[in-house]
């Protein structure tokens, strides 16, 4: 038999050459073409375990889009067909609470989760029997990268700033069941860095697949949550990156975000986009913000993979992504996930389990709303699946799709055995369906959040609520004394407010120099190398949120360190949530706060205002009786009619839907 | 471009009195913490908090001993900050300095040198005895 080459082995303490065998009915045959599903035997540790496959059919599209660029830079998006792809999922006959991950493309590679243990598997390199190799996850050599510096390395501050343990309070949540009784779907991007693709020999098939295959182990870990996790799109950088990467995890995840939100968001819609990096950050694994899942601005997330293999990749990814989802660190808290450590342990442990913490922290992001963009299902051109009915996605060519046929008993509209409407159905689902049927144009279906934000009604022909759209970046709020930002107007007092309670209010200026210019976890302007970085004066007021008449101690899930500064007959409040260095700092006052006349706050900078790139003359363009909003279109006040608020009207802009119904305006808002 | 300019300095005798102005150009005054500084001869680069407006048109403060003497109040129609200062005495004697401050907090009035954004160049207020 081949013997395996030191490259493939040499990251594993102990591993086992065995020969899996397909099962058929009527015997034990060798590998055949992809099916449908399929089972093998496989040994491990002196037993057998028959292991029961079936495609991911909700992982990949018809219209599988996967974006690159040429020599010159120019986008090429295209869509190979791989409809008949070779990603499994499944369990271990007799195995309780088993999952599999596997890809059969070129012999089996993936994950076995048994009870007490989990499983790699691989084909064995240069062998011409089909002998692979299977190995404890445990025995995986891994370097000891954390998610982070720990916190509670840093050494205590100096004596004038008197740390305070905040007082005992109830859980604002009981514990609850782990899973969520209703699906969400993650719709995932991910984005290739030129390095990662030169280490991959160029071969954009070889990422490709590879990404693919990092998905559906992704989908393996998420599903004991209740959570789906759906590829709608992949980029690779292959001429070059499109950020720059130099600096610390912290700038390159601001890098990135910024990216996004300017590029991204408006070739594909996703609600989370991970960045995966050849570069490491001295020991950080990864780092993403907390809770921002649905945010245009901040929902996404950093990923060093180097050398490891993708099976451990793929727990810093599901760990990274977790933080998106709401998802603090484990360390410290009364965590279990039936293993050594879990997923969102901040050392990169290689685990393949939530714990119940992380399901409590998801559960309490959509409890807060945080999670809205993660109800709906994947639109039949957005993900990467394969079509089939009863998946729960309504994939091209389906009109609906109520899942199984026990839970399409209770679904009114949809045809379950054939995924189209009934007779009678103009829809099935959708904020503006009820009933099976269209609500009438001009019915709100999603409010106004902020004196920001816009809101948007059914138009009447669609089970769709409009697309989401705000108040330009840029546009003056707040009487004034701030600007909006990504749909909230920023500024430092409801930040405040936010973190310590209704009655707390920004600090003086000169408590932000005072503390800001320390740069130490309690006074800092970001997060560089090893190290916090002090505020040059002109920065402090985008360095860390210092509050005032404070009387609530926050709770986030997690018990934040607090720390009080004398400062001329009062006390400046500033928290750390100690998450860990791979989490931004939600302490931290907001990117787009105003922080002088003219000037807002970007990544601990106090700079020119004018980076909003607003440019709305709302005398000109609204005749003064709208403002512009985020798609640069007018949004007109109720009596004037869009597109420029020149004529009587309804108000509304060409983006939001008809305000009102000739049939019954009592739904005008 | 931002401006602050003083004017009213002089000599006085102990007892007197004297105006200061600042008028401001190029900043949205109203936004702004006007603040009076003072710096004492023969003490380079240690100025003085002496009095100050905040933003919100309400709040003033005063260092403890110009207290019930000297009265700071501004014009927004004018873009200017006033200090009526009574009762000088010779320990007032400095160079006054007007600067200009953007606060998180509306009502904050800042002391520290280092939190303020616009400074004027100074009139000197000379107090005989």
């Known amino acids: 038999a081949a013997r395996p080459g030191f490259q493939q082995t040499s990251h594993l303490s102990s591993y086992e050459i065995i020969t899996p065998w397909r099962l058929t009915r009527e015997r034990r045959e060798a590998p055949r073409p992809y099916s449908k599903q399929v089972s093998y035997v496989i040994q491990a540790e002196g037993k057998e375990h028959i292991i029961h496959l079936e495609r991911n059919k909700d992982l990949l599209p018809e219209d599988f889009v996967v974006y690159t660029y040429n020599k010159e830079g120019t986008l090429i998006t295209d869509h190979p067909n791989i409809q008949n792809h070779c990603h499994y999922r499944g369990y271990v006959e007799g195995v309780h609470n088993s999952s599999i991950a596997l890809s059969d493309c070129f012999g089996l590679r993936g994950l076995l989760h048994l009870e007490n243990a989990s499983y790699g598997i691989e084909p064995l390199q240069n062998s011409s029997h089909f002998e692979h190799i299977i190995y404890r996850m445990d025995d995986v050599y891994k370097e000891p990268l954390k998610c982070g510096v720990s916190n509670k390395d840093i050494e205590k501050e100096t004596a004038k700033d008197e740390e305070e343990e905040p007082p005992s309070m109830t859980q604002l949540l009981r514990r609850r069941r782990a899973v969520l009784p209703q699906t969400r779907y993650v719709e995932l991007f991910i984005v290739v860095d030129k390095e990662r693709y030169d280490m991959m020999g160029r071969n954009q098939t070889a990422v490709r697949e590879e990404m693919i295959l990092l998905a559906n182990y992704l989908d393996s870990m998420y599903i004991m949550l209740n959570i789906r996790i759906v590829l709608v799109g992949l980029e690779i950088w292959t001429n070059g990156n499109l950020i720059n990467i130099v600096g610390g995890a912290g700038d390159v995840l601001g890098n990135f975000v910024q990216w996004r939100e300017k590029f991204l968001i408006t070739r594909r819609r996703h609600d989370s986009a991970q960045l995966v990096l050849k570069k490491g950050f001295g020991g950080t694994a990864g780092m993403a913000f907390v809770g921002t899942v649905c945010s245009r601005s901040h929902a996404g997330g950093i990923n060093v993979f180097g050398q490891i293999t993708v099976e451990t990749f793929a727990s810093i990814v599901a760990h990274e992504l977790g933080h998106n989802l709401g998802m603090n660190h484990d360390d410290g808290r009364d965590c279990s996930c039936g293993a050594k450590s879990c997923i969102m342990n901040s050392g990169a442990s290689g685990s393949r389990n939530f714990s119940s913490c992380s399901a409590e922290d998801f559960e309490k992001l959509t409890l807060n709303k945080g999670g809205n963009c993660l109800l709906n299902i994947p639109k039949p051109d957005e993900a990467y699946s394969a079509p089939s009915c009863g998946n729960k996605l309504v994939d091209a060519g389906e009109e609906c799709d109520c899942g199984t046929p026990k839970e399409c008993e209770l679904d009114p509209c949809c045809e379950g055995s054939t995924c189209k409407l009934k007779s009678f159905a103009e829809c099935a689902y959708g904020d503006c369906c009820k009933d099976c049927r269209f609500l009438p144009g001009g019915t709100l279906c999603r409010g106004k959040t902020s004196e920001c934000d816009v809101p948007e009604y059914c138009n009447g022909s669609s089970q769709f609520c409009q697309p989401d759209v705000f108040i330009q970046n840029g546009y003056p709020c707040q009487n004034n004394k701030a600007y909006c930002y990504n749909g909230m107007c920023q500024y430092y007092d409801a930040q405040c407010q936010v973190i310590f309670g209704s009655k707390a209010k920004a600090a003086p200026k000169d408590c932000f120099i005072e503390v800001n210019s320390k740069g130490d976890r309690f006074g800092n302007c970001g997060f560089s190398g090893n190290e916090y970085k002090k505020c040059a004066t002109g920065n402090a007021l985008c360095g860390k949120l210092q509050c005032e008449n404070v009387q609530e101690i926050p709770v986030f899930g997690i018990v934040p360190a607090i720390i009080q500064t004398p400062s001329r007959g009062t006390k400046c409040w500033g928290v750390d949530f100690q998450l860990g260095s791979d989490v931004p700092d939600p302490g931290m006052v907001n990117e787009g706060t105003k922080c002088g006349a003219g000037k807002i706050c970007r990544n601990f900078q106090c700079v020119d205002a004018s980076v909003l790139n607003y440019d709305c003359d709302v005398q000109k363009k609204c005749h003064g009786h709208g403002v512009c909003n985020s798609n640069k279109n007018c949004h007109c006040e109720n009596g004037w009619a869009p597109p420029n608020c020149e004529t009587k009207g309804y108000g509304g802009s060409v983006d939001s839907g008809p305000t009102y119904n000739e049939m019954n305006t009592a739904l005008r808002d | 471009e931002v401006h602050l300019v003083e004017s009213g300095g002089g000599v006085v005798q102990a007892g007197g009195s004297l105006r200061l102005s600042c008028v401001a150009s190029?900043?949205?005054?109203?936004?702004?913490?006007l603040v009076w500084f003072r710096q004492a001869p023969g003490k380079e680069k240690e100025r003085e908090f002496v009095a100050g407006f905040a933003a919100n048109g309400i709040n003033t403060d005063y260092t403890d001993s110009v207290k019930g003497r000297f009265t700071i109040s501004r014009d927004n129609a004018k873009n200017t900050v006033y200090l009526q200062m009574n009762s000088l005495k010779p320990e007032d004697t400095a160079v006054y300095y007007c600067?200009?401050?953007?606060?998180?907090?509306?009502?904050?009035?800042?002391?520290?040198?280092?939190?303020?954004?616009?400074w004027g160049k100074g009139t000197l207020v000379t107090v005989s005895s």
């Open positions: 600067a200009a401050s953007w606060t998180p907090a509306y009502n904050d009035i800042p002391r520290h040198m280092s939190s303020m954004d616009q």
């Open positions: 190029g900043l949205p005054f109203s936004e702004y913490a």
